[in-house]
Interface confidence: low
């Protein structure tokens, strides 16, 4: 769990820099994945350990503010806060060394236990993938930064320019649950072991040779569509929500967050001066200014909030987990002060939740969201955020309850509908999920125009035989989520030749094809021997891609890595393949045997990337009943012959023979990828 040494990665990740902050960080990952707009940068700080706990100061009831507060009395807010601050998560405990009496914090650090640890990703990213990896997936205009909600110079003057202090809401297109994808970009998926389909198995990028510096001209444009099957996402501030409804826009414009209580209005000039420093990027000076204000006015919520923002900025500047944890704690302190304006309280806790998620403190973030919902029970958007918070820790049941509650109060909440539909589909309640996904997308509400929802709606419709599926894929394509109606892969490099079926000559890999076809019996016999003697090496498909039947795989290479154990079972096949780096080095693919038994139907599905082509060598093919459709053309396998298709296009498989079908799958890099791209694209 050695955490990221920023010195090691700074300067090496420049061309990943999608948001212009001079380095690769989580925001860039978000942009590259289409989960965030290009603009603000936030610190690339993977999870480390828990924030220190600060005892709250004594609470006193908050004075009423005339505008933009919840119906509940502020006294209630304060007492609730008081209770909840004391009941803070262990994440907030001040923990000692492992051998000491209390041990080290674990739960926010224990994500290392999975193959999806953030630290790995930031330690080993290669510098070559360009920030031009835009995606058709999601054109988002501009991220709301942590302070876009309240430009101090404007917001503190709750009068002068009536429009100047409104939160930047109406033009944002940041999708509700897709703000920071902390763990998303390059990981070895713990959940999906792809088969012929295949699901995504993303892994951290391996470091490039040191002697291969990358110029800006060596840019790879990788389009990353939004659908990752399993996605870890953050909840952006509510103020990031877009609204297209003119009436709603008008309402939004009227709402000016009130960030100053009576006392803070009396020290507004000092607050303004400190904030100006922050705005001008003089972070260290701003930190000192706000620290001094906090020292002078320890009960000032706005000074404390300014200090938190400065620490937040400083964490970004220094790429420091430690500083960011301090910011998270200071946002918490804001909430524990007396007489905090409700708007400031909400902003502070929302930012706290957001930064906790950024650090990977999903459960801590969930607690913050729970507090927000308790403090502002009438704010549906917070409940929606809470639902996502539950989803982020894998708690579908509680997420479902939250969305049921939202829908019982606001039955037309599109965001709640798509997420509720999403959960139903995850629970394999296919038919039930459709109306929620459909109506949710149709609502046009913020956070609903998300590729995953189109993907799952189309998929659900296909599974119940509803031809309308393609209408939704078409719409998803038009809205930039998919490359085409047929080609719905997620991790795409722009401009690669796109066709469902290929001939060996078109691929340029004729030697590999010849070798496979010449040696097909040897390959077959080793596969059959493994089936005979070590059947356990064939692992069943577990991605819910089958309508029915039995389908398993035995993998020799994945992500460009040879599986030594597996190759013991098929040594000659492995030796044969070693001569062909276009496949053994294809980090976005696999080499594997695939056995499918009679009575199997694989639903239409798409692979994760357009960066590979998939070769199928027929080994044991029943006379009839086995076929594969890719896009709108259906073919059959032949023993000893290779079929080549681009599995980023929708494909479907039927096995209605009377005996098993065995094929050998060999993924190769898309022939139009340059050697540079092949070296630097993150693995799948």
């Amino acid at each position: 769990f050695d955490l990221v040494d920023y010195e090691e990665v700074l300067g090496k990740l420049g061309i990943y820099d999608a948001d212009g902050d001079g380095d690769f960080d989580v925001d860039d990952a978000k942009v590259l994945l289409g989960l965030k707009e290009r603009s603000t940068s936030e610190p690339a700080v993977p999870p480390e350990e828990a924030e220190p706990h600060t005892e709250p100061e004594e609470q006193v009831p908050v004075e009423a503010e005339p505008q933009n507060i919840e119906d509940e009395a502020k006294e209630q807010i304060q007492s609730l806060l008081h209770e909840m601050v004391h009941a803070e998560h262990v994440e907030g405990e001040d923990l000692q060394q492992e051998d000491g009496p209390t041990g080290e914090p674990q739960q926010e650090d224990d994500e290392f236990l999975m193959a999806t640890d953030v630290d790995d990703r930031f330690e080993t990213l290669e510098p070559e993938v360009s920030h031009e990896e835009t995606e058709h997936s999601y054109h988002v205009e501009e991220t709301v930064s942590q302070d876009c909600n309240q430009d101090m110079e404007e917001m503190m003057s709750e009068q002068e320019n009536p429009d100047s202090s409104e939160p930047v809401v109406e033009d944002e297109r940041l999708h509700h649950d897709t703000d920071d994808v902390t763990y998303q970009v390059y990981e070895e998926q713990a959940v999906y072991e792809p088969l012929e389909n295949e699901g995504i198995e993303i892994t951290e990028v391996t470091a490039p040779p040191e002697d291969n510096p990358v110029e800006d001209s060596q840019v790879i444009v990788e389009e990353v569509s939004i659908f990752p099957v399993e996605e870890q996402q953050e909840v952006p501030p509510e103020t990031n929500r877009k609204t297209d409804d003119p009436e709603q826009k008008a309402k939004v414009k009227k709402k000016k967050p009130k960030l100053l209580n009576k006392f803070d209005k009396t020290i507004k000039a000092e607050l303004d001066a400190a904030e100006k420093l922050r705005k001008r990027g003089k972070i260290e000076e701003a930190v000192n200014a706000f620290k001094e204000l906090v020292r002078k006015y320890p009960q000032s919520p706005r000074a404390r909030y300014g200090k938190a923002q400065c620490e937040d900025d400083l964490a970004e500047k220094r790429r420091s987990n430690e500083v960011l944890r301090g910011a998270i704690e200071t946002y918490q302190e804001v909430a524990s002060l007396p007489d905090v304006p409700a708007d400031l309280l909400k902003l502070s806790l929302k930012r706290r939740s957001d930064r906790q998620q950024f650090l990977g403190h999903m459960r801590g973030s969930l607690l913050t969201l729970q507090r927000l919902v308790q403090l502002f029970p009438n704010d549906t958007s917070l409940k929606n955020d809470l639902g996502v918070g539950y989803l982020l820790i894998g708690d579908n049941d509680n997420a479902k309850k939250v969305y049921e509650e939202v829908l019982s109060v606001t039955p037309n909440d599109g965001f709640a509908k798509v997420h509720y539909g999403f959960i139903l589909k995850a629970q394999n309640k296919i038919a039930e999920s459709i109306p929620y996904l459909k109506e949710g997308i149709e609502s046009g509400d913020p956070g609903t125009d998300d590729g995953r929802f189109y993907f799952h709606l189309g998929d659900a419709m296909q599974r119940v035989g509803n031809k309308e599926a393609y209408k939704w894929y078409e719409l998803g394509h038009k809205r930039g989520h998919f490359a085409s109606v047929w080609q719905r892969s997620l991790y795409n490099v722009n401009g690669l030749k796109a066709q469902p079926w290929w001939t060996p000559k078109e691929t340029g890999y004729t030697e590999l094809v010849k070798s496979l076809e010449r040696n097909w019996k040897l390959i077959r016999d080793e596969g059959l021997a493994v089936m005979d003697k070590a059947k356990g090496l064939f692992l069943p498909e577990d991605e819910n891609l089958r309508e029915k039947g039995d389908w398993s795989q035995f993998t020799l290479w994945q992500q460009g890595r040879r599986n030594e154990n597996a190759c013991k079972g098929a040594p000659k096949t492995c030796t044969l393949l070693e001569k062909f780096p276009e496949t053994t080095g294809c980090r976005r693919g696999q080499i594997k045997y695939s056995i499918m038994h009679p009575g199997t139907h694989v639903w239409p599905h798409t692979g994760p990337t357009n960066c590979r082509l998939r070769m199928h060598l027929g080994l044991v093919i029943p006379k009839e009943g086995c076929k594969i459709r890719c896009a709108n053309e259906t073919k059959t396998w032949e023993e000893g012959k290779v079929l080549i298709f681009d599995d980023s296009f929708e494909h479907e498989v039927w096995q209605d023979a009377s005996s098993f079908r065995l094929i050998f799958i060999v993924d190769v890099w898309h022939p139009e990828l340059t050697p540079q791209q092949r070296r630097s694209l993150p693995a799948i």
Epitope: T102, G103, D109, D120, E187, E230, R363, L392, G536
Partner: antibody, heavy 127, light 106 residues
Framework: QVQLVESEGGVVQPGRPLRLSCAAS????????MHWVRQAPGKGLEWVAV????????RYAGSVKGRFTISRDNSKNTLYLQMNSLRPEDTGVYYC????????????????????WGQGTTVTVSS | IVLTQSPATLSLPPRERVTLSCGTS??????LAWYQQKPGRAPRVLTY???NKAAGTPARFSGSGSETDFTPAISSLEPEDFAVYYC????????AFSPGTKVDIK
């Protein structure tokens, strides 16, 4: 099916080393973190160590820190526990256990604690 | 973090409802799992994160509690439920198990 099988333990003298191994099958070993847990005769469970999916990081209980080393070979689907400077109090049944994982679409790292265990192997430290 | 369990042994007849108890010396939020172990066998996870049932855990098992006090329950004891039950926290390093409660037939 999903299986973890520990190697034979054995009787070893205090101060001597012993290496345990745990062979995994039926699942994608390289995607799972792994634990060792032990149980002294007639006593409760004691967590010993954990290693990340790729072997890059590990953690230990205070009682074994500096003496025991957890490691793995993903190409062989095998987990190891190298035990040095063994003491009588290290006697017990040693289990390897897998860290389970969720198939929730939103959450990648979330996991189900120790969801698959080996049958256990007995280590006796005695002169 | 120290985990305590009470009682050490519980003698109950079949079909009785049983409630166990586990306390932690610090707030572990909901990072608590329950394991069942039968003599001569490896433990098996029953619930994780307090109340989430692991695959294969019968419906009669339930978990509740948060922070420092946790109480799993078995609504109606079946013969196969007589075993030792451990709670385990994974909120802090090092991970730790409780001493265990033995549930035996009265």
């Amino acid at each position: 099916q999903v299986q973890l099988v520990e190697s034979e333990g054995g009787v070893v003298q205090p101060g001597r080393p012993l290496r345990l191994s745990c062979a995994a099958s039926g699942f994608a070993f390289s995607s799972h973190a792994m634990h060792w847990v032990r149980q002294a005769p007639g006593k409760g469970l004691e967590w010993v160590a954990v290693i990340s999916h790729d072997g890059s990081r590990d953690r230990y209980a205070g009682s074994v820190k500096g003496r025991f080393t957890i490691s793995r070979d993903n190409s062989k689907n095998t987990l190891y526990l190298q035990m040095n400077s063994l003491r009588p109090e290290d006697t017990g049944v040693y289990y390897c256990a897998r860290v389970g994982r969720s198939s929730n679409w939103f959450s990648r790292y979330y996991y189900y604690d120790m969801d698959v265990w080996g049958q256990g192997t007995t280590v006796t430290v005695s002169s | 973090i120290v985990l305590t369990q009470s009682p050490a042994t519980l003698s109950l007849p079949p079909r009785e409802r049983v409630t166990l108890s586990c306390g932690t010396s610090q707030n572990v939020s909901h990072h608590l799992a329950w394991y069942q172990q039968k003599p001569g066998r490896a433990p098996r996870v029953l619930t994780y994160d307090v109340a989430n049932k692991a695959a294969g855990t019968p419906a009669r098992f339930s978990g509740s509690g948060s922070e420092t006090d946790f109480t799993p329950a078995i609504s109606s004891l079946e013969p196969e439920d007589f075993a030792v039950y451990y709670c385990q926290q994974r909120s802090n390093w090092p991970q730790a198990f409780s001493p265990g409660t033995k549930v035996d037939i009265k």
